[in-house]
């Protein structure tokens, strides 16, 4: 099935809170959109994200 980025982020934030309270761990952040520049991108219509 497809993976919803928002759901993944919500889950991650829940785990982050749990890790902080239960294990005294600090997770700063994870970027789901840190991608290299798409030099191979082709022209084409679409809706900007």
């Amino acid at each position: 099935g497809t993976i919803n980025v928002h759901d993944v982020e919500t889950q991650f934030n829940q785990y982050k809170t749990e890790a902080a309270s239960r294990y005294n761990l600090t997770i700063s952040d994870v970027s789901v959109s840190d991608v290299p520049f798409p030099f191979s991108a082709q022209s084409g219509a679409g809706v900007p994200g």
Partner: antibody, heavy 122, light 106 residues
Framework: EVKVVESGGDLVKPGGSLKLSCVVS????????MSWVRQTPGKRLEWVAT????????YYPDSVKGRFTISRDNAKNTLYLQMSSLKSEDTAMYHC???????????????WGQGTSVTVSS | QIVLTQSPAIMSASPGEEVTLTCSAT?????IHWFQQRPGTSPKLWIY???NLASGVPVRFSGSGYGTSYSLTISRMEAEDAATYYC?????????FGSGTKLEIK
Amino acid sequence: EVKVVESGGDLVKPGGSLKLSCVVSGFTFSRYGMSWVRQTPGKRLEWVATISGGGTYIYYPDSVKGRFTISRDNAKNTLYLQMSSLKSEDTAMYHCTRDNYGRNYDYGMDYWGQGTSVTVSS
Amino acid sequence: QIVLTQSPAIMSASPGEEVTLTCSATSSVSYIHWFQQRPGTSPKLWIYSTSNLASGVPVRFSGSGYGTSYSLTISRMEAEDAATYYCQQRSSSPFTFGSGTKLEIK
């Protein structure tokens, strides 16, 4: 509403250094690549640097490589450009731009700030 | 690096006239972006990925092209279209801009 505001421009002597800042609001900063583009007194546009949303991927043209450093602080919604060994040809209006690209698309620099002026002269 | 040549450098058009601005690349590129800049303002993304109008751009504008030859067309020139238009390629590094076409209204 997306806002992009640059600061830090100044008159500096050749060989000197300067750090530009760009504060943004109105969108999730960490999800977007950001760039610096300069416009020379002759109105030519020149790309200066690009950094990915998380700061992992950084690109420069040869003209500034080794002299300029782009960085970002996602907690502060701020983009930076550290410039050193400045030359007279670096004189320009420096614009901060949002980059709307992803893994397999490039929708361009879709928001630009008004710019901050850098003059390199003795 | 890929050099983008825009022609003409300056042109004028009458209201209602069709206008075509061209952008020629020294090597083949996958797509280009177009920016509009009015005096005293920052450039604005106008057409992205060759043919897609940016938000708020009137439908009288269109973009086309492939390889080394690209164009921006205004079907019917209006006074507010008077500005300088720049093309940009990001198919290969360094990203480069054309030197611009200044479009004036007659």
